[in-house]
């Protein structure tokens, strides 16, 4: 069976939107009005992995781009990157480990934990216009909570 996907945007808990910053990086900033069109639309795919009521394994691709968020070790540190893939083969039900995030729903907010690096989360900074990154702390200065807005296909 083909993998199930939906289109969505994400905003952090301070209502910052995610936009492209160069070819392989996302940044978070406040947008309004027509600028909202700059925000990236994700194709969220529901993939194979350990699942529970509040934890669902997903992959986050950029809609109509052959780019996926992935988590790899760089200089011994878990790192978030945008990775290009062959569009003929993706998305797929069995994604490589580095592409899988556990989508965790808590109090109507979403967290995205790396399946490869437990307790590391997609994060944004308090500051404006800073890169989206993989953070190893929750509840500190950095933001790990998001809301999801559905986008029609």
């Amino acid at each position: 069976a083909p993998v199930r996907s939906l289109n969505c945007t994400l905003r952090d808990s301070q209502q910052k939107s995610l936009v492209m910053s160069g070819p392989y990086e996302l940044k978070a900033l406040h947008l309004q009005g027509q600028d909202m069109e700059q925000q990236v639309v994700f194709s969220m795919s529901f993939v194979q992995g350990e699942e529970s009521n509040d934890k669902i394994p997903v992959a986050l691709g950029l809609k109509e781009k052959n780019l996926y968020l992935s988590c790899v070790l760089k200089d011994d540190k878990p790192t978030l990157q945008l990775e290009s893939v062959d569009p003929k083969n993706y998305p797929k039900k069995k994604m490589e480990k580095r592409f899988v995030f556990n989508k965790i729903e808590i109090n109507n907010k979403l967290e995205f934990e790396s399946a490869q690096f437990p307790n590391w989360y997609i994060s944004t900074s308090q500051a404006e216009n800073m890169p989206v990154f993989l953070g190893g702390t929750k509840g500190g200065q950095d933001i790990t909570d998001f809301t999801m807005q559905f986008v029609s296909s």
């Epitope: 194979q48 992995g49 350990e50 790899v72 070790l73 990775e83 290009s84 893939v85 062959d86 083969n89 069995k94 490589e96 480990k97 580095r98 399946a115 490869q116 690096f117 437990p118």
Partner: antibody, heavy 120, light 107 residues
């Protein structure tokens, strides 16, 4: 020091089954990011990745196996298994287990291999 | 599946020579490539990972380079213990696939 030791190889007729074991020491398969894979090598041929299991139980298989093999782990016994069913002559090979950490993989430590012969 | 093609299949060289082995992928594999050395009757040994990072304990005469779909393993000055078979492995996409091997033999 990391060690991996394969066992369970032998001769079997086509259609038969075998269970290979990979007993390891020097690391734990409950450590996040840790994985163990099986790689085989037919006599005089190259290497072929067979299957892999991560610390969290996530499994992967080479689709060429058509669902005949199953990987599993017993974390408390520090052992990974490869259950091989419906064996064919082309499964004849040395089977190595090897350790990796994180994806993308590279296999850091290898066992010495166990030989599987499928013949009537 | 991603096909990995090594060249040459066999390479004859002498002690002290500089040798290069090439591995080509059927599609872009980023830098997700590792190299292994195998001697007859033995298990493979990791030499290089992430295209160019030397595994601990591996002599510095071994080096790796490349990106995208073309990669090389270079031995700067062959030693007697380097005569063996070398394999590349791509980790970009499941199923992970090896090159067919390059046998390095004494000239």
């Amino acid at each position: 020091e990391v060690q991996l030791v394969e066992s369970g190889g032998g001769s079997v007729q086509p259609g038969g089954s075998l269970r290979l074991s990979c007993a390891f020491s020097g690391f734990s398969l409950s450590t996040s990011g840790m994985g163990v894979g099986w790689i085989r090598q037919a006599p005089g041929k190259g290497l072929e990745w067979v299957s892999h299991i991560w610390w969290d139980g996530d499994e992967s298989y080479n689709p060429s196996l058509k669902g005949r093999f199953t990987i599993s782990k017993d974390t408390s016994r520090n052992t990974v298994y490869l259950q091989m069913n419906s064996l064919r002559a082309e499964d004849t090979a040395s089977y190595f287990c090897a350790r990796n950490r994180y994806d993308p993989p590279w296999f850091v430590d290898w066992g010495q291999g166990t030989t599987v012969t499928v013949s009537s | 599946d991603i096909q990995m093609t090594q060249s040459p299949s066999t390479l004859s060289a002498s002690v002290g020579d500089r040798v290069t082995i090439t591995c080509r992928a059927s599609q872009d594999i980023s830098n997700y490539l590792s190299w292994y050395q195998q001697k007859p009757g033995k298990a493979p040994k990791l030499l290089i990972y992430y295209t160019s990072k030397l595994h601990s304990g591996v002599p510095s005469r071994f080096s790796g380079s490349g990106s995208g779909a073309e990669f090389t393993l270079t031995i700067s000055s062959l030693q007697p213990e380097d005569f063996a078979t070398y394999f590349c492995l791509q980790g970009k996409m499941l199923p992970w696939t090896f090159g067919q091997g390059t046998k390095l033999e004494i000239k």
